[in-house]
């Protein structure tokens, strides 16, 4: 059920998962000069029941005299059962935080973690795309990608987003950060026919613009 590849890259766009499906694993990686504590967890695992999801395990890094050479690990299901549960939600989250059943939020930062987080996504995971600052969406369809299972293989759908290089500080109304809400996406596809639907680019431009409350400056 793990997704084989990373989500697709779109020129001049960035993507983010707003929540992580149960079964997602996050490697406990430390930045250079630090390593996982002895007997520390190799990964965090999003687990839960019908009413609540949370991250099992807690990543911890400690100073290291030698460079951390631990390999990235994709744990096997048997290993997962032996892990103890540690609640990793921030105690200072505003009360209106979005909550998607069957999903975990981004784990809070841990001390001296690696710059990049390495996630092992599961089928059904969705990531959302936006044009980076200085670019705007020219042709837009769903600016998202979903990991799907087809013919026993996983693939990420192609986000229908093109970012053009015209400097633009305004945003389309549809470019708000998605709220975590049930998507009702199928976790597998029964048909062997792969259509071009995921790859068709919509050519309609948004007719209205919405001024952002943010402006940007590059140092």
């Amino acid at each position: 059920e793990l997704c084989d590849d990373d989500p697709p890259e779109i020129p001049h766009a960035t993507f983010k998962a707003m929540a992580y499906k149960e079964g997602t694993m996050l490697n406990c990686e430390c930045k250079r000069g630090f390593r996982r504590i002895k007997s520390g967890s190799l990964y965090m695992l999003c687990t839960g029941n019908s009413s609540h999801s949370s991250w099992d395990n807690q990543c911890q890094c400690t100073s290291s005299a030698t460079r951390n050479t631990t390999k990235q690990v994709t744990p096997q299901p048997e290993e997962q059962k032996e892990r103890k549960t540690t609640e990793m939600q921030s105690p200072m989250q505003p009360v209106d935080q979005a909550s998607l059943p069957g999903h975990c939020r981004e784990p809070p930062p841990w001390e001296n973690e690696a710059t990049e987080r390495i996630y092992h996504f599961v089928v059904g995971q969705m990531v959302y795309y936006q044009c980076v600052q200085g670019y705007r969406a020219l042709h837009r369809g769903p600016a998202e990608s979903v990991c799907k299972m087809t013919h026993g293989k996983t693939r990420w759908t192609q986000p229908q987003l093109i970012c053009t290089g015209e400097m633009e500080t305004s945003q389309f109304p549809g470019e708000e950060k998605p709220q975590a809400s049930p998507e009702g996406r199928p976790e597998s596809e029964t048909s062997c026919l792969v259509t071009t639907t995921d790859f068709q680019i919509q050519t309609e431009m948004a007719a209205t613009m919405e001024t952002s409350i943010f402006t940007t400056e590059y140092q």
């Epitope: 890259e9 983010k16 935080q97 600052q133």
Partner: nanobody, 130 residues
Framework: QLQLVESGGGLVQAGGSLRLSCAAS????????IGWFRQASGKEREGVSY????????FYADSVKGRFIISSDNAKNTVDLQMNSLKPDDAAVYYC???????????????????????WGKGTLVTVSP
């Protein structure tokens, strides 16, 4: 667990200046957007400014642009907010917050929303007298 600790709040006259600081010992700055929200009494928490810890790009709410300056010292793990020409409307509790960067170390302003932050400080009070 890693904590964010704000300091520098206080009472200032309109037109005056304050410098807020957020200490985030142990935070890997180049993996996060780090910045500030504020919440005035009876109002919703709103984004003020943030800095991309990877590329140093900065973002400001229109209401503070030209008056506030955000900066970071990655070696000291601090982010400062220099607030000039303060107005009574700037009075609020100011919260430090962090959010993971997106792919390629990029971050967009629509992500800087209270429900989506990964970690919050406890806040520091800024009072501006007329």
């Amino acid at each position: 667990q890693l904590q964010l600790v704000e300091s520098g709040g206080g009472l200032v006259q309109a037109g005056g200046s304050l410098r807020l600081s957020c200490a985030a010992s142990g935070l890997t700055f180049d993996g996060y957007a780090i910045g500030w929200f504020r919440q005035a009494s009876g109002k919703e928490r709103e984004g003020v400014s943030y800095i991309n810890g990877r590329d140093g790009s900065t973002f400001y709410a229109d209401s503070v642009k030209g008056r506030f300056i955000i900066s970071s010292d990655n070696a000291k793990n601090t982010v400062d907010l220099q607030m000039n020409s303060l107005k009574p409307d700037d009075a609020a509790v100011y919260y430090c917050a962090v959010d993971r960067l997106g792919s390629r170390g990029a971050y967009v302003s629509t992500w800087w929303r209270p429900p989506d932050m990964d970690l919050w400080g406890k806040g520091t009070l800024v009072t501006v007298s007329p």
